[in-house]
Interface confidence: low
């Protein structure tokens, strides 16, 4: 996630009009305080995502944190965020308006919390005090969040001076509780559904025996409740759950369900949430994609993985040169599709000591009635190389003709060379490269010839040596990225009388 | 890079046929999916029809019936052919490449034609 101009931080002048451009490879979305502002996004050119938020004419009210985030319907595996906090000094407002529940601080043990006074100019002094007492306390002050430390069960107030006004707070009250520890989980059938199917989610309690659950979900906001079943798992420890069923999913119930779960004895509670997406329609899409030309190793096994993402769960199937492929029996070929997540496949071929006639084009297509997508690639499969022969002719002209072929996949590469003293060569001396010289000694020339039903190269590549004065060894290597092989022969001048 | 290039468009009478043309060239591998949209002025831009590299067609509910998306793999062209046409018909018509997935969202097209007009006259 990239957030242009950079923050963490921005002051801007009251009125103003501020853009905000987030950036990432997947679909994001800005939100301030769980809501989302209006904002534009859009697929950039080259595949990105944007999501711009423009501040227009700019208040007080506007200073707060914002959020750049994964839009949800990507599920949790892209839960990354990024902040930037805005501050609009505006002298017509002091503290930032609060929400009257967030005035009432409940406090478990002695831990450390935070009264929430906030203002809109980071340039101001902020000063806490005891209610009862003028006496400023000596608690660090963060303009982002407000007054951070330990806090006894008393009245606080939150002061400070804008122009030549003091200005007060609301009144905050801190509440210690002694509670005793409360197991909340909180699981979904399904987190992602389609119109029309069901959505079941389960708050389950371990170890309470009486205790309250609330509900919290999309369809409340138009009125329409939904009565959750109780259900008592006894046992040791005890469980209690509360279920939701929702028969037929709307559009409008994608969201998030929150059970909060409150011990009726001590006012204790835990809350916890998921969020459920539906979705009009089903969906494939591809998550990864491979190269158009993927390497196997001649005798060597080789897995193509393809990463995709789908809901309802797709078929699979692979192809090779358009023809369907299936597990063999012989196990030269083995298929899987495995469910990594909700929502998330992937699709494995393996084949078993690669054959050259599994060289070809593969498609792997993954579909159901709303979708489809399908990836395809050449399978390239790679052959050592070898020497199948070297020769010798000896035309009428006094030259000696060399001819040397052999194969390989991928394409491979000649290399003459030539050594004079017999007894030390090759290991003692090193060889001579022969080429086309420009003295006209030696004259090469080279065939490529691609042999398709054998999906590997042949290469011959013939030697003229115009005049050999003394016995010499001739060695023709073949090279490719799977490995080296030569053979060599040992030339003598027409005029001795022996050959080797 | 892929480029999509139209053709096809007039002035005909409501009631009559039409067949657009959209040619693609520079293919990628992972472009699976070629459909056209509609703008007309003052409104947003509008899925019509796509087809996929294997055949799969998907329409907008309003021309299904009328319209009917092709593609010639050999030339690497998809055709439109619009029948019955009615004024509201009336638009800009782009050619949209991409590789899948909400193939009835524009946001599933990376690469856009300039358009073809199409006009519809009562």
């Known amino acids: 996630l990239v957030i242009t101009p950079p923050g963490p931080e921005f002051v801007l002048n009251i009125s103003s009009t501020f853009v905000l451009t987030c950036s990432s490879s997947a679909p994001v979305m800005w939100e301030q305080m769980s809501q989302v502002p209006w904002q534009e996004a859009a697929m950039n050119q080259d595949g990105t995502f944007s999501s711009v938020l423009t501040l227009t004419n700019v208040t007080g009210g506007d200073t707060g944190e914002y959020f750049c985030v994964y839009n949800n319907s990507l599920g949790p595996e892209l839960s990354e965020r990024k902040r930037i906090y805005i501050f609009v000094p505006d002298p017509t407002m002091g503290f930032l308006p609060m929400d009257s529940e967030d005035l009432f601080i409940f406090v478990t043990d002695v831990t450390e919390t935070t009264i929430p006074c906030r203002v809109t100019d980071p340039q101001l002094e902020v000063t806490l005090h005891e209610k009862k007492v003028d006496i400023p306390l000596h608690v660090p002050y963060d303009h982002q969040r407000g007054f951070i430390g330990t806090f006894e069960d008393k009245t606080y107030i939150c002061k400070t001076t804008i122009g030549d006004r003091e200005v007060d707070s609301d009144t905050y009250y801190v509440y210690s509780l002694q509670v005793s520890s409360i197991n909340v989980s909180v699981n979904a059938v399904q987190t992602v559904v389609r119109q029309g199917e069901s959505i079941t989610i389960r708050c389950i309690v371990m170890g309470n025996d009486v205790v309250n659950f609330q509900w919290t979900y999309p369809r409340m906001k138009s009125g329409r409740l939904v009565e959750p079943v109780t259900d008592y798992l006894f046992g040791v420890p005890s469980r209690i759950g509360s279920i939701l069923h929702i028969p037929t999913a709307e559009l409008s119930d994608s969201g998030t369900y929150t059970c909060n779960v409150s011990v009726s004895v001590n006012d204790h509670g835990d809350e916890k949430a998921i969020n459920v997406t539906v979705i009009e329609n089903g969906y494939v899409r591809l998550l990864e994609t491979l190269e158009d030309v993927q390497i196997a190793e001649l005798h060597r096994s080789r897995t193509l993985q393809v990463v995709f993402e789908a809901y309802p769960t797709p078929s699979v199937l692979w192809f090779k040169d358009n023809r369907t492929l299936g597990d063999s029996s012989a196990g030269e070929l083995v298929l899987s599709t495995r469910n990594v997540s909700e929502t998330r496949y992937v699709s494995e071929l393996t084949l078993v000591r690669v054959k050259v006639s599994e060289a070809g084009y593969y498609t792997m297509r993954a579909f159901h009635a709303d979708d489809q997508v399908q990836l395809s690639f050449k399978l390239q499969v790679n052959v050592p190389v070898r020497v199948l022969e070297l020769s010798e002719s000896h035309p009428a002209n006094g030259e000696q003709i060399l001819r040397c072929r052999g194969r390989g996949m991928p394409q491979p590469n000649v290399t003459w060379s030539t050594c004079r003293d017999l007894k030390r060569c090759p290991r003692k001396l090193s060889p001579t490269p022969l080429g086309n010289s420009s003295k006209e000694e030696s004259q090469l020339e080279t065939n490529v010839t691609f042999w398709e039903e054998d999906q590997e190269y042949e290469v011959v590549s013939t030697l003229r040596l115009r005049h050999v004065d003394q016995p010499l060894s001739v060695r023709c290597m073949l090279q490719n990225s799977m490995g080296r092989d030569s053979q060599e022969v040992t030339v003598v001048p027409h005029s001795l009388p022996f050959k080797v | 890079e892929v480029q999509l290039v139209e053709s096809g468009g007039g002035l005909v009478q409501a009631g009559d046929s039409l067949r657009l043309s959209c040619t693609v060239s520079?293919?990628?591998?992972?472009?699976?999916?070629t459909g056209w949209f509609r703008q007309a002025p003052g409104k947003e831009r509008e899925f019509v029809a796509a087809i996929h590299q294997i055949g799969s067609t998907y329409y907008r509910n309003s021309v299904k019936g009328r319209f009917t998306i092709s593609r010639d793999g050999a030339k690497d062209t998809v055709y439109l052919q619009m029948n019955n046409l009615k004024p509201e018909d009336s638009a800009v018509y782009y050619c949209?490449?991409?590789?899948?997935?909400?193939?009835?969202?524009?946001?599933?097209?990376?690469?856009w034609g300039q358009g073809t007009q199409v006009t519809v006259s009562s």
């Open positions: 520079g293919r990628t591998f992972n472009t699976y999916v």
């Open positions: 949209a490449a991409g590789n899948g997935g909400y193939v009835m969202s524009d946001i599933a097209y990376g690469t």
